[in-house]
Interface confidence: medium
């Protein structure tokens, strides 16, 4: 029951996370204009991964897409790539995890297959979350660098033909959405990986056992060995009853008189 709950919760958390990553990628507010020290606040600029917008206090908004691909900064291209990879991996992970859910029965799918699929989707969610966090962090770093460069440029003189002052930009809403969404996807992935351990079927590993008659007074007691799950304490198939039964690992080093009967 706890395994099903962990798997289900992991799926829901990852679903919310991936929806957030998609939303953040599509949002225009990755960076917003810092209006500090600006004499005219009627025009408000903000940028996304795909287009740049200008909004006025009147409500008028104009957005233009970055139609050029080669002319864009390499870092912006890298952020786009990271976010898309995150979305693709997350989408595949969601598809795999739907079939892996313990509460959903698909034909005669064994628990081992569901466990493997749960682990696969969990890893995909983790990588997806990391891609989103990395993408958002790279963009945030671009902004911080741009902000401090701009701050330095604001105090330059009026010499020369044309003076350029970079408009300072700060973190937009999309960055926070991206960070939270990436974190949720990551948490969901971890939960799926934890659920995978509980889903792993109990393996019945009977090792070859040699029985040695140690005397007429001791009879063999059946059920002396437990099936190993791989997670229990009896992983070495240690003998439970000292009724003369021994595993291959415990064969006597010195032959007894009964060995040659």
């Amino acid at each position: 029951m706890a395994v099903t709950a962990c798997q289900g919760l992991g799926f829901v958390v990852s679903l919310i996370g991936i929806a957030g990553i998609i939303a953040a990628t599509c949002m225009d507010q990755w960076s917003t204009q810092d209006l500090y020290n600006n004499p005219v606040t009627a025009v408000f600029n903000y940028q996304g991964l795909w287009r740049s917008c200008v909004r006025e206090s009147s409500g008028f908004t104009e957005c233009r897409g970055y139609f050029t691909l080669l002319g864009l900064p390499a870092m912006l291209q890298a952020v786009r790539a990271l976010m898309i990879v995150g979305i693709v991996l997350g989408a595949i992970g969601l598809l795999v995890s739907i079939f892996a859910l313990k509460c959903i029965r698909i034909g005669s799918m064994e628990d081992s297959a569901k466990a493997n699929m749960t682990l696969t989707s969990g890893i995909m969610f983790i990588v997806s979350g990391l891609c989103a966090i990395a993408g958002v962090s790279v963009f945030a770093n671009m902004l911080v660098t741009n902000f401090w460069m701009s701050t330095a440029n604001m105090y330059t003189g009026m010499g020369g033909m044309v003076q350029t002052v970079q408009t300072r930009y700060t973190f937009g809403a999309a960055l926070f959405v991206g960070w939270v969404a990436g974190g949720l996807t990551l948490i969901g992935g971890v939960m799926m990986c934890i659920a995978c351990r509980g889903l792993a079927p109990e393996e019945t590993n009977y090792k070859a056992v040699s029985y040695h008659a140690s005397g007429h007074s001791v009879a063999y007691k059946p059920g002396g060995f437990k099936a190993s799950t791989g997670f229990g304490s009896n992983t070495k198939n240690k003998k439970i009853y000292d009724g003369g039964a021994r595993t291959e690992d415990e064969v006597q080093s010195y032959p007894s008189k009964h060995d040659y009967v």
Epitope: Q47, R64, Y66, L70, T164, V165
Partner: nanobody, 121 residues
Framework: QVQLVESGGGLVQPGGSLRLSCAAS????????MHWYRQAPGKQRELVAS???????HYADSVKGRFTISRDNSKNTLYLQMNSLRAEDTAVYYC???????????????WGQGTLVTVSS
């Protein structure tokens, strides 16, 4: 390289008119706000008028009703029509634009070199 070049300044009598132009040239992706500033000798630079991308205008109280700002988006040009000029309008007029260069992400603020307007009899 983006450049803002002002023209149209000169000597004019009080009550006269002048039309300033500011042409933005270079690889421009989008022009956002465009503004006219002025700086009189020994004074701080002040905002005269501004125009938004949709054409909404803002004016300093001292020039309202006398100056008109306009822009031609197809030519990337800003204009300032100055009527009923007074001696206190004497200053160097600067063109200012927030614009995004082609291949850029963020808008930068550009200034022209300035054009002198002298109102004297």
């Amino acid at each position: 390289q983006v450049q803002l070049v002002e023209s149209g300044g000169g000597l004019v009598q009080p009550g006269g008119s002048l039309r300033l132009s500011c042409a933005a040239s270079g690889s421009i992706f989008r022009i956002d706000g465009m503004h006219w500033y002025r700086q009189a000798p020994g004074k701080q630079r002040e905002l005269v008028a501004s125009i938004t991308p949709s054409g909404i205008t803002h004016y300093a109280d001292s020039v309202k009703g006398r100056f008109t700002i306009s822009r031609d988006n197809s030519k990337n040009t800003l204009y300032l029509q100055m009527n009923s000029l007074r001696a206190e309008d004497t200053a160097v007029y600067y063109c200012n634009a927030h614009l995004v260069k082609v291949g850029g992400v963020w808008s930068d603020e550009y200034w022209g070199q300035g054009t002198l307007v002298t109102v004297s009899s």
